[in-house]
């Protein structure tokens, strides 16, 4: 008789998940020699321990604490780039501007980026069939809790001027329900962070509106100001040009607003 298995609404664990995490870890330590002494097998063991044999709707930040002990990676606290709904451009930016870091440029973020995982209560199996969906099943699932935990720690570590890239093409440029809006904004430390600078990325080529005046940006400004952090906002009218100018800042066409 086949054993009854919980059927969740979300996609199952990414195939070859253990091998992928281990391989990513090894690759990361090779790319970042300051992490050369990290034992990736121990990292995987701690990652696995956070969700294996646990009910995938009953995961807590506490479950990830052993793994978070590795999260003391030293990222310059004044070089942090947060993003919301515009991951690809944020990552393209930090690939060019090598001294700035998104969460996915850190080891833990790099390990988990774009992956899904969950286990099953009381068995050591990884569930490759389905995992809980945040909306349809439960919010305390392994993936959501992981990103909430690492995002909180990343925001807490930030200092001086923190940048955030926001998608100006969306109806809610700033979304209170995003990870940025629900976690990171509230965990910036006012005693360390002087300013949050938002970069609103325009989608349309002919879009010359000042999206810094958008009601949701004003809402963000209000939240940030109430936390005693200054707020500034810039329109990035041409993201392609913006990246080009990051690559070649001395280009004469890069003095005008982009």
């Amino acid at each position: 008789v086949p054993r009854w298995r919980q059927q969740w609404s979300g996609p199952g664990t990414t195939k070859r998940f253990p091998e992928t995490v281990l391989a990513r870890c090894v690759k990361y330590t090779e790319i970042h020699p300051e992490m050369r002494h990290v034992d990736c097998q121990s990292v995987w063991d701690a990652f696995k321990g956070a969700f294996i044999s646990k009910h995938p709707c009953n995961i807590t930040e506490e479950d990830y604490q052993p793994l978070m002990k590795l999260g003391t990676q030293t990222v310059p606290c004044n070089k942090i780039l947060l993003w919301s709904r515009i991951k690809d451009l944020a990552h393209q930016f930090t690939q060019v501007q090598r001294d700035m870091f998104t969460l996915e440029d850190t080891l833990l973020g790099y390990l988990a980026d774009d992956l899904t995982w969950c286990g099953e209560f009381n068995t050591s199996k990884i569930n490759y069939q389905s995992c809980p969906d945040w909306r349809k099943d439960c919010s305390n699932n392994p993936v959501s809790v992981f990103w909430k935990t690492v995002s909180r720690r990343f925001a807490e570590a930030a200092c001086d001027v923190v940048h955030v890239m926001l998608n100006g093409s969306r109806s809610k440029i700033f979304d209170k329900n995003s990870t940025f809006g629900s976690v990171e904004v509230h965990n910036l430390q006012p005693e360390k962070v002087q300013t949050l600078e938002a970069w609103v990325i325009h989608g349309g080529r002919e879009d010359s509106r000042d999206l810094c005046q958008d009601p949701t940006i004003k809402e963000l400004e209000s939240i940030i100001s109430k936390r005693n952090i200054q707020f500034s906002c810039k329109n990035i009218y041409r993201p392609d040009k913006f990246l080009q100018c990051v690559k070649n800042p001395e280009d004469s066409s890069c003095t005008s607003e982009i």
Epitope: P33, E34, H37, D39, S42, K69, L70, T72, T74
Partner: antibody, heavy 118, light 110 residues
Framework: QVQLVESGGGLVKPGGSLRLSCAAS????????MSWIRQAPGKGLEWVAS????????YYADSVRGRFTISRDNAKNSLYLQMNSLRAEDTAVYYC???????????WGQGTLVTVSS | QSALTQPPSASGTSGQRVTISCSGS????????VYWYQHLPGTAPKLLIY???QRPSGVPDRFSGSKSGNSASLAISGLRSEDEADYYC???????????FGSGTKVTVL
């Protein structure tokens, strides 16, 4: 073969300064992290400082931070340790070491003795 | 007070197996490779084991390393008189942003 030769040790009074050098040969010096490790008389090994390859990042033990400065000159295949505000507890044999790709100290010099005494 | 704890001494007769323990925490051994060094008086220390259990070329297979959780150990089988030395474990420590050594274990061949 890999050779690391330390020099610059000697007797110095408390509060004084000394600069240790390490001449490296037999490997591509600019590719590797380099470190200083010391051993006080009758005591164990103690890591002192490391310097990365590329645009150098430096790391220090709490016991020497703010007093010692590690640096490198890739053109001269040389590693240095500038030691200021020396204390009696800094008395030790100082070893220069090359780091491997996984952080291990693969090669060591023979050491140079630093004695801090009035 | 070393961040990594080793027994001060260990001994065995020629041909015996000796094991040296090294205990630390999640900030060092837990998430980082363990290295073992052999140090004979008046000579430069020598790397015996890296990445928990790997031997550099030239190191006899009588030396083996292992790691479990926040602890590691070095085993010397077929003990020989030339193995008389001080043995140190080491690892990177995240909380110190630097390497830590064990206090050292003096191995004596009886």
């Amino acid at each position: 073969q890999v050779q690391l030769v330390e020099s610059g040790g000697g007797l110095v009074k408390p509060g004084g300064s000394l600069r240790l050098s390490c001449a490296a040969s037999g490997f591509t010096f600019s590719d590797d992290y380099m470190s200083w490790i010391r051993q006080a008389p009758g005591k164990g090994l103690e890591w002192v400082a490391s310097v990365s390859n590329g645009r150098p990042t430096t790391y220090y033990a709490d016991s020497v931070r703010g007093r010692f400065t590690i640096s490198r000159d890739n053109a001269k295949n040389s590693l240095y340790l500038q030691m200021n505000s020396l204390r009696a507890e800094d008395t030790a044999v100082y070893y220069c070491a090359r780091e491997g790709w996984s952080g291990e100290f693969t090669d060591w010099g023979q050491g140079t003795l630093v004695t801090v005494s009035s | 007070q070393s961040a990594l704890t080793q027994p001060p001494s260990a001994s065995g007769t020629s041909g015996q197996r000796v094991t040296i323990s090294c205990s630390g925490s999640s900030s060092n051994i837990g998430f980082h490779f363990v290295y073992w060094y052999q140090h004979l008086p008046g000579t430069a220390p020598k790397l015996l084991i890296y990445k928990n259990n790997q031997r550099p070329s030239g190191v006899p297979d009588r030396f083996s390393g292992s790691k479990s959780g926040n602890s590691a150990s070095l085993a010397i089988s077929g003990l020989r008189s030339e193995d008389e030395a001080d043995y140190y474990c080491a690892a990177w420590d995240d909380s110190l942003s630097g390497y830590v050594f064990g206090s050292g274990t003096k191995v004596t061949v009886l």
